[in-house]
């Protein structure tokens, strides 16, 4: 018996088709993915084969202005309109805290939302009981699959889930749900989460009876071949893992942003296991026509947000300074608003030890691309903050030991002068550059904010201890040189989209005036 | 207004066949998986056989695998039973259902009102 | 498959009664549970799904718990219109079962 998964994994709302990076679709003819080309191809093979699943691995939730303003509504609209079979739960679908998963997405989806290691407590448990599920049975032709699934037990720290969700451990929640559909004569077992690829791995050889694990989280790209984009492969599609018990278990992942999607050949036999598994990821590029339907629902939608750019958020009475000329040469305040913005939005995780779990930013001045003039009546829109952060990056959190962050504020300064966007603006930290001394060795002082203290202070930077640090996912992935970055990070979980972040903080601020405050010297 | 509409009922002899169709109107059809539910005399129910949106998955309750086939036409808004080899035992009201989702699984919130099916000599 | 074992099989409660009846699946069934209610010569109506979510327009009288093999239905104050037969089912793997159904009469 032969089964086709469709996958998509870390969508992140780019319901309508983006460049190849993944930013804002400017050339149609080159254009890429949104769901009305992935309806098309869905379809296709829907129509051609006959044994077909539509999984989706979680983070459909925030990315770009559709998430902004429909706040996960367009996800269950969508989705529903692309009949996805299941969805499992990814950290993003929290951003908005359980409400603004609960009713945008689990009451409205048609189909199952899954984890089966997050566990409801105290009012929330009859809340939303049946909300979300461990497993789900689906009848496939004549067959049934069963599809359990997982989200990483991080979440807490990446996103809002509140208090009342405990996120255990994926394996040691995984396991008796597995075993309960053994029970119910379901012999062929998808897991479908979003840990990231090395607990897909984990996950394939530790758990008994999974036969099959389609994951996210880690934006991973697989391919068996040569790759038809710019994506480097991680690995062979699927990439294959040998279980504790002996079985080779297929474990696959689509990249990201919809660009791709997953396809993969099972066959099974009668006992429900692998015999065969091949595939690849499809790049849904303009070769696939979209579907008119979807596109025109698509078109239908899009008047809201282009409503929303032009309303004011907040109001600035300073002038927010986000030249080139200020931000690569020196501390510019355009680049402590954003540094303020990127640390408020990761609030959260206090306790009577930490104030909270991270402190620091680092941002490259080159990312900041323009000004805000306060002239305008102080009004800041969504369509200012698109001018300043056009690039449709995000924040994310990274786990560096502090001889990296080091070498990282070295490379800062190691050409200065050159107005090039490696300079670093700042918060959290406290950064002396002595600039008569030889490149590499500039960095006089480096003092940041301590997180396990009643009362936050700058402390020396420690080169052994590990940091969380807060910055672009540009500078994560070694962007403008930061190559230490890249190589030398302990940990990188991708957070929300740039301009979010700085909207939600203005508007929440309501009035803003940053400062040049001695940060960088 | 929601409403399914059973058609296709009435007396048939052993061995024989029947075909129940089902209309569906005031929702879109094929956003839905659709069941057959049946009701002996004086008994309780007992699920036929279910449906998803595209008829790419279906389902049977053993007592009829082999003999009934369900089917549907999403261009038509109907959904229909083709009963063959019809047996005394198959004697029920025949119930239209909508499940609540487009998948199969989930749990039947429309209701028609029934064609009853007799199968005598 | 699945068996849905329903008690009692009818009862008899007096208006404003708080009823309950219990269904007992053969086999865990986390929360894939449903509750109907059939009135006699009408078509049965879905009260309650995933074992403790009301239905749309249902009142609130109605209400189901429980996960696993055990699930109980409840009645907080029984009304003259709640005369019927009530019926679990399991959603959780096809084919899908009905418990044998609860007749249930006004004293």
């Known amino acids: 018996w032969e089964l086709t998964i469709l996958h998509t994994n870390d969508v992140h709302s780019r319901l309508e088709q983006t460049s190849e990076d993944s930013s804002k679709c400017v050339n149609a003819s080159r254009c890429m993915g949104g769901v009305a080309r992935l309806f098309t191809k869905v379809q296709q093979i829907r129509r051609a084969e006959p044994n077909v699943l539509l999984l989706d691995a979680g983070d459909q939730y925030q990315g770009t202005i559709w998430f902004t303003v429909y706040k996960g509504a367009e996800v269950a609209h969508f989705m529903n309109a692309l009949r996805y079979d299941a969805m499992a739960l990814g950290n993003h679908e929290f951003d908005n805290g359980v409400e603004g998963l609960i009713e945008p997405l689990l009451k409205e989806a048609k189909f199952p939302i899954l984890s089966a290691n997050i566990k409801a407590k105290g009012p929330l448990a009859s809340q939303i009981s049946g909300l979300y599920l461990p497993y789900k049975v689906l009848p496939v032709g004549d067959e049934v699959v069963g599809i359990v699934g997982y989200t990483s037990k991080e979440t807490p720290f990446l996103s809002n889930p509140g208090t009342n969700l405990v996120f255990e451990d994926e394996i040691t929640a995984l396991q008796p749900e597995v075993d309960k559909l053994k029970t119910l004569n379901v012999n062929k077992i998808i897991a479908l989460g979003h840990s990231g690829f090395e607990t897909d791995k984990l996950i394939a050889q530790k758990v008994r009876g999974v036969d099959v694990v389609v994951g996210g989280h880690s934006n991973t790209f697989l391919y068996t071949g040569n790759p038809p984009s710019k994506e480097v492969p991680a690995g062979k599609y699927p990439f294959i893992v040998t279980s504790d018990d002996g079985r080779k278990v297929p474990v696959v992942q689509a990249y990201a942003f919809g660009k791709y999607l997953g396809y993969l050949k099972i066959e099974f036999d009668e006992r429900g296991n692998v015999i065969s598994s091949h595939g690849n990821p499809i790049l849904l590029n303009s070769s696939i026509p979209e579907d008119p339907s979807i596109k025109a629902d698509i078109n239908k939608w899009r008047i809201k947000l282009d409503n929303y750019s032009t309303q004011e958020l907040g109001k600035t009475i300073v002038y927010l300074d986000g030249s080139s000329q200020s931000c690569r040469f020196r501390e510019c305040n355009m680049g402590n608003l954003i540094c303020d913005a990127m640390i408020n939005n990761n609030l959260r995780h206090a306790d009577e030890m930490f104030w909270n779990h991270v402190s620091m930013c680092i941002l490259n001045g080159g990312g900041i691309r323009s000004p805000i003039d306060e002239r305008n009546n102080g009004t800041i829109t969504w369509e200012n903050l698109a001018a300043v952060l056009p690039f449709g990056g995000t924040f994310d959190l990274v786990q560096l030991k502090g001889s990296t962050l080091k070498k990282a504020f070295e490379h800062s300064v190691h050409r200065y002068g050159q107005s090039t966007g490696e300079f670093l603006q700042v918060g959290g930290i406290h950064v002396v550059y002595d600039l008569s001394r030889k490149p590499g060795d500039r960095v006089v002082k480096l003092d940041v904010l301590c997180t396990k203290c009643r009362v936050p202070s700058y402390d020396p930077l420690k080169m052994d201890e590990i940091y969380k640090v807060i910055l672009p996912n540009f500078l994560a992935n070694g962007g403008d040189g930061f190559q230490m970055i890249k190589d030398e990070l302990l940990r990188h979980d991708s957070g929300d989209q740039d301009i979010n972040v700085v909207s939600t903080y203005i508007s929440k601020m309501k009035v803003i005036y940053p400062a040049v405050e001695g940060r960088i010297k | 207004e929601v409403q399914l509409v059973e058609s296709g009922g009435g007396l048939v002899q052993p061995g024989r066949s029947l075909r129940l169709s089902c209309a569906a109107s005031?929702?879109?059809?094929?956003?839905?998986?659709m069941h057959w539910v049946r009701q002996a005399p004086g008994k309780g129910l007992e699920w036929v056989s279910g449906i998803s949106w595209s008829s790419g998955s279906i389902g049977y309750a053993d007592s009829v695998k082999g003999r009934f086939t369900i089917s549907r036409d999403n261009a038509k808004n109907s959904l229909y039973l083709q009963m063959n080899s019809l047996r005394a035992e198959d004697t029920a009201v025949y119930y239209c259902?909508?499940?609540?989702?487009?998948?199969?699984?989930?749990?039947?919130?429309?209701w028609g009102q029934g064609t009853t099916v007799t199968v005598s000599s | 498959d699945i068996q849905m074992t329903q008690s009692p099989s009818s009862l008899s409660a007096s208006v404003g009664d708080r009823v309950t009846i219990t269904c007992q699946a053969s086999q865990d069934i986390t929360n894939y549970l449903n509750w109907y209610q059939q009135k006699p010569g009408k078509a049965p109506k879905l009260l309650i799904y995933d074992a403790s979510n009301l239905e749309t327009g249902v009142p609130s009288r109605f209400s189901g718990s429980g996960s696993g093999t055990d699930f109980t239905f409840t009645i907080s104050s029984l009304q003259p219109e709640d005369i019927a037969t009530y019926y679990c089912?399991?959603?959780?793997?096809?084919?899908?079962?009905f418990g044998g159904g609860t007749k249930v009469e006004i004293k």
């Open positions: 259902a909508k499940d609540r989702r487009y998948g199969l699984t989930y749990g039947m919130d429309v």
């Open positions: 005031g929702f879109t059809f094929d956003d839905y998986a």
């Open positions: 089912q399991q959603s959780v793997v096809l084919p899908f079962t």
